[in-house]
Amino acid sequence: LNTTILTPNGNEDTTADFFLTTMPTDSLSVSTLPLPEVQCFVFNVEYMNCTWNSSSEPQPTNLTLHYWYKNSDNDKVQKCSHYLFSEEITSGCQLQKKEIHLYQTFVVQLQDPREPRRQATQMLKLQNLVIPWAPENLTLHKLSESQLELNWNNRFLNHCLEHLVQYRTDWDHSWTEQSVDYRHKFSLPSVDGQKRYTFRVRSRFNPLCGSAQHWSEWSHPIHWGSNTSKENPFLFALEA
């Protein structure tokens, strides 16, 4: 699908919102004020929010968003059907799961309906914009007298995620962290029974199914150690 640049109807005030840029044409070219950047995130491949800074506009403007997918069966231009608002001005668009196609180039166009020449078209790789939900159901198993194993679950295809485990004792000033691949388990080989440990995990859609840079939120922490339950020292799933 070729991007069409919408042209004005001739009735616009061409003196208000314009500034000069060095465009490659024979005569001096006049361009409108740039539109805000659109930033999209796909939350656990359940929905996607594409947002922009509506306060960057010189005056309150209900910008409109259209989108399509390049080179695909979904290349028909779609209007945003669910706008997000900030102080009663459009500031984003939410797309539902059925409208998300991770491995096709997503094209998003922001436009000022009062000045059709004011439009900006961006291209995005949605597989690099996935943010999974935080890991859940953290559990600790005591494998031996001094070895602990941490397990957790994700509400997504496990092989698509990598993880970061952080742990520390009450005596530590900072976290120790360890990267974990798609296996979503972590072993701590040497545990001091006199200390209380705290563990937490976050996940990222990388590297097998995408190249996302953003991590999920941290899980709820789980604790193990000197002041945890003595009744079953071999299985703990206590959340803070």
Epitope: S31, L35, E37, Q109, Q119, A120, T121, Q122, N128, Q213
Partner: nanobody, 126 residues
Framework: QVQLQESGGGLVQAGGSLRLSCAAS????????MGWFRQAPGKEREFVAC???????FYADSVEGRFTFSRDNAKNATYLQMNSLQPEDTAVYYC????????????????????WGQGTQVTVSL
């Protein structure tokens, strides 16, 4: 403010290759979205390729699989490797840049770019 200068254009036979360079001066390109556009005589300027400073690259349908966009932030330059050139690729090729806040911002709309080079002529003969 960044200044952009293209080079590498020329006359080439159909099926041949060229590598265009876009050198930036005045400021680093590390936080700029970059694009290549072209304009053939009597035609509108058209999108060729673009990238975000986060590393995502995109192409127009007409050049996908033949052209490759790359950037070298250390050299403050971007490149357009053009293979399997056809006569319809004949045009003046322009490099463009826009400072962006987000690593994922890549523009295919020419009016989103604030800085332009002067262009380099590419002519493909049969």
């Amino acid at each position: 403010q960044v200044q952009l200068q293209e080079s590498g254009g020329g006359l080439v036979q159909a099926g041949g290759s060229l590598r265009l360079s876009c050198a930036a001066s005045g400021r680093t390109l590390s936080r700029y979205a970059m694009g290549w556009f072209r304009q053939a005589p009597g035609k509108e300027r058209e999108f060729v390729a673009c990238d975000s400073w986060g590393g995502d690259t995109f192409y127009a349908d007409s050049v996908e699989g033949r052209f490759t966009f790359s950037r070298d932030n250390a050299k403050n330059a971007t490149y357009l490797q053009m293979n399997s050139l056809q006569p319809e690729d004949t045009a003046v090729y322009y490099c463009a840049g826009a400072p962006t806040s987000f690593a994922t911002t890549a523009y295919s709309s020419s009016n989103s770019y604030t800085v332009w080079g002067q262009g380099t002529q590419v002519t493909v003969s049969l």
